[in-house]
């Protein structure tokens, strides 16, 4: 089986990655805070995409530590029990309920800093994490519906005739591929226990003047295209691999 | 089994401060727990006033600002609510109560044992 | 603050039937909601906490629903103890806040 060449059949046309920093956070300064108050209480709720392997902090609503009672963070995390971290603050006391997952810690002590840390985060780490701020005027809230990207591993190779495969494997959430230009595609979606979802595009082209196809995969943490040469050599399959 | 006792005098004049206590037997209130008043109005109302923890520190209703001390003797187990400037609409039956044992420190905010209460009229 | 509506203010029922105390949140309490039994000159009881969750000692005639804003305090079979003042009281949130009372009476 001949793998394709860069430097001939085979070639990166572009790559567009957002590579995601070490660590992630929708934390405010002190600036923005003092700006946006009201507005971040009432924005409760926020979707949240992280990329595997990063670090995540979540942040709590800018209240005062001095006006505070309490400091929860609930997590609820799929097929397991909610987990509760709290700190009461009057008897500097933390308590931990139903929380067995190491990674996920408060940033530093509760009394300097309400935020949550989730250290390298995994697939298992999707869910609904929530910051409640007791004080003597209510509660206040913060929830984050934290979504786990991962990359898909993608591959292009012709298996046959005018035929190309494209594959976005293992991704989170499923990529998008599209090719230029258009064939007789099928699609194909593979989900995986863990979440990830392998697609498959395979294309024809009759139209015997297509000598070059490029393929483009579409994802939340970046995009990628590869184009590849149509070689009528029959029974010959050529590929590679793109990380 | 804890049981709570209110005492204090039943008629105070208006302008004057209100003062209760609160007498704890069968458990030491420097030993967990937060400690509560809560009061009844004519008509059958219930307003939570406040607290003290077991460590000392306190949390009052905002709106009755600073009329509003609770304190506690340790010595005596005992916890004291003092309500400054009083007008007739403090008249209430005042009760003494202990949270819930706190699961996770959070929403366990209801109260298991209560004293009977103490009846206060603010007149001249 | 959480406004607590209790109703109705008064009911009047035999021993061996059975009553509803309904409580309404004036915002989403989700299910932090305790029930309480008064009684002239003795101390209160706690029946019910977390909307649903008998507190030791309460017998099992007594039952507690709902979620959000609307909860049910549903009494069955009562017997002569259970007349008297009952209250509502969310615990979602400070200040704790009551309902206004439902007075149970016998027919």
């Known amino acids: 089986e001949g793998a394709a060449q860069p430097n001939n059949s085979l070639m990166l046309q572009t790559s567009k990655e957002n590579h995601a920093l070490a660590s992630s956070s929708l934390c405010m300064d002190e600036k923005q805070i003092t700006q946006n108050y009201s507005k971040v209480l009432a924005e409760v709720n926020t979707s949240w995409p992280v990329k595997m392997a990063t670090n995540a902090v979540l942040c709590c609503p800018p209240i005062a530590l001095r006006n505070l009672i309490i400091i929860t963070w609930e997590i609820i995390l799929r097929g397991q029990p909610s987990c509760t971290k709290a700190y009461k603050k009057e008897t500097n006391e933390t308590k931990e309920t139903n929380c067995t997952d190491e990674r996920i810690t408060w940033v530093s002590r509760p009394d300097q800093n309400s935020d949550l840390q989730i250290r390298t985060v995994a697939i298992t780490h999707d869910g609904y994490y929530r910051c409640i701020m007791v004080t003597p005027d209510g509660n206040f809230h913060r929830g984050y519906h934290l979504q786990v990207l991962v990359t898909p591993e993608v591959t292009l190779f012709q298996n046959r005739n005018r035929t190309a495969v494209c594959k976005a494997v293992a991704g989170k959430p499923a990529a998008h591929i599209s090719w230029i230009p258009e064939g007789d595609c099928a699609t194909k979606q593979e989900y995986w226990s863990n979440g990830t979802v392998t697609v498959k595009s395979t294309c024809h082209w009759e139209v015997h003047n297509v000598s070059t196809v490029t393929c483009h995969v579409s994802h939340l943490t970046g995009n990628k295209s590869l184009y590849i040469e149509l070689l009528p050599v029959p029974g010959a399959k050529k590929s590679a691999k793109l990380y | 089994e804890i049981q709570l006792q209110e005492s204090g005098p039943g008629l105070v004049k208006p302008s004057q401060s209100l003062s209760l206590t609160c007498s704890v037997t069968?458990?030491?209130?420097?030993?967990?727990?937060?400690w509560s008043w809560i009061r009844k109005f004519p008509g059958n109302k219930m307003e939570w006033m406040g607290y003290?923890?077991?460590?000392?520190?306190?949390n009052y209703k905002p709106s009755l600002g600073s009329r509003i001390s609770i304190t506690r003797d340790t010595s005596k187990n005992q916890f004291f609510l003092q309500l400054n400037s009083v007008s007739p609409e403090d008249t209430a039956t005042y009760y003494c109560?202990?949270?819930?044992?706190?699961?996770?420190?959070?929403?366990?905010?209801?109260?298991?044992?209560w004293g009977p209460g103490t009846m206060v009229t603010v007149s001249s | 603050e959480v406004q607590m509506t209790q109703s109705p203010s008064t009911l009047t029922a035999s021993p061996g039937e059975s009553v509803s105390i309904n409580c309404k949140a004036s915002k989403n309490i989700r299910s932090y909601l305790a029930w309480y039994q008064q009684k002239p000159g003795k101390p209160n009881k706690l029946l019910i906490y977390?909307?649903?969750t008998l507190h030791s000692g309460t017998p099992s005639r007594f039952s507690g629903s709902g979620f959000g804003t609307d909860f049910t305090l549903t009494i069955r079979n009562l017997e002569p103890e259970d007349f008297g003042l009952y209250y509502c009281q969310q615990h979602h949130e400070y200040p704790l806040t009551f309902g206004s009372g439902t007075k149970l009476e016998i027919k």
């Open positions: 003290i923890n077991y460590g000392g520190s306190t």
């Open positions: 069968g458990y030491t209130i420097t030993s967990g727990y937060d």
């Open positions: 109560a202990k949270y819930n044992e706190y699961k996770s420190y959070i929403y366990d905010w209801y109260f298991d044992f």
């Open positions: 977390s909307g649903s």
